[in-house]
Interface confidence: low
């Protein structure tokens, strides 16, 4: 069957340094399982992290991500699941699409992330 | 037991500013997008404005943009919609509604507030 | 901005009556589309989200369905509680809109 595919409608801020979480979710909402489920950089679709046949798939990942990825899944038998990237990189900034594959139907959301300093601030007046 | 609670509404002059207030609890609000809401009398809903769980981000219905301002503070765990240059046409119940999802996209509304009345008249 | 039109505007039935209600989008919004219930002076209750998933605590008897630009809400068998307005609502693109209402009344 047909879904959607939805990530969030604002950009996401991280700090350098930290961890951030990238939800994204199929709509209706079905058991994802047994999807192709990943995110990737546009413009030139380099793999951020692929989930595929029940199992990360690790050797896909470009290496400025490899071993800061995780995806969460608890949810994916609702059709939801989150992307978790640790130790941000200024480079992480941008945007990033998340997709669901079932089968031949594919279909994908953009989502964006705002990278900030954390040792940046204004002083008062 | 999540509530949602307006205040603020009233009978103002056109013209005229108002502040509508939306006190939340049962629920963790800073992780929630809300929105507000309005029916004229008598006639169907019209989404006017939405904010994201952070405050970061909001949105507007044309018919209020630059005239309404959406905020929150989250450490109060209350919505904010200031009206200004109030229009006879802006006469509605303004409900505050919260965002079924948190951060995510597709705006619709599982809790809502009882409501609160704001007049535009002279 | 998308246009939602529902049909009947107002319908009369009587408790036991299959009711259905459609809501067309004037562009195809995939299926964000909910369905709501408001009773005079109350605030609106959400019954059915994502078209067709039923939202916690609403009884069975309601139910969606439709996708890209034909929704329809079905009461399989209309009870006193039942009598109200009901309003469609799509979620796809900024700025959310609203159906016009369907007025559900006792015949």
């Known amino acids: 069957g047909q879904f959607r595919v939805i990530g969030p409608r604002h950009p996401i801020r991280a700090l350098v340094g930290d961890e951030v979480e990238l939800p994204c979710r199929i709509s209706p909402g079905k058991n994802a399982t047994g999807m192709e489920v990943g995110w990737y950089r546009p413009p030139f679709s380099r793999v951020v992290h692929l989930y595929r046949n029940g199992k990360d798939q690790d050797g896909d990942q470009a290496p400025e991500y490899r071993g800061r990825t995780e995806l969460l899944k608890d949810a994916i038998g609702e059709g939801k699941v989150t992307l978790r990237i640790r130790n941000v990189r200024f480079s992480d900034e941008g945007g990033f699409t998340c997709f669901f594959r079932d089968h031949s139907y594919q279909e994908e959301a953009a989502m964006e992330l705002k990278v900030e300093d954390p040792f940046y601030w204004v002083s008062p007046g | 037991e999540v509530q949602l609670v307006e205040t603020g509404g009233g009978l103002v002059q056109p013209g005229g500013s108002l502040r509508l207030s939306c006190a939340a609890s049962?629920?963790?609000?800073?992780?929630?997008?809300m929105s507000w809401v309005r029916q004229a009398p008598g006639k169907g809903l019209e989404w006017v404005s939405d904010?994201?769980?952070?405050?970061?981000?909001?949105y507007y219905a044309d018919s209020v943009k630059g005239r309404f301002t959406i905020s929150r503070d989250n450490s109060k765990h209350t919505l904010y919609l200031q009206m200004n240059s109030l229009r006879a046409e802006d006469t509605a119940v303004y409900y505050c509604?919260?965002?079924?999802?948190?951060?995510?996209?597709?705006?619709?509304?599982?809790?809502w507030g009882q409501g609160t009345l704001v007049t535009v008249s002279s | 901005d998308i246009v939602m039109t529902q049909s009947p505007s107002s319908l009369s039935a009587s408790v036991g009556d299959r009711v259905t209600i459609t809501c067309r989008a004037s562009q195809g919004i995939s299926s964000a589309l909910a369905w709501y219930q408001q009773k005079p002076g109350k605030a609106p209750k959400l019954l059915i989200y994502?078209?067709?998933s039923l939202e916690s605590g609403v009884p069975s008897r309601f139910s969606g369905s439709g996708s890209g630009t034909d929704f329809t809400l079905t009461i399989s068998s209309l009870q006193p509680e039942d009598f109200a307005t009901y309003y469609c609502?799509?979620?796809?693109?900024?700025?959310?809109?609203f159906g016009q209402g369907t007025k559900v009344e006792i015949k």
């Open positions: 904010i994201n769980h952070s405050g970061g981000s909001t």
């Open positions: 509604a919260k965002d079924y999802y948190d951060i995510l996209t597709g705006s619709f509304f599982d809790y």
């Open positions: 609502q799509q979620f796809n693109s900024y700025p959310w809109t």
């Open positions: 994502d078209a067709s």
């Open positions: 049962g629920f963790t609000f800073s992780s929630y997008a």
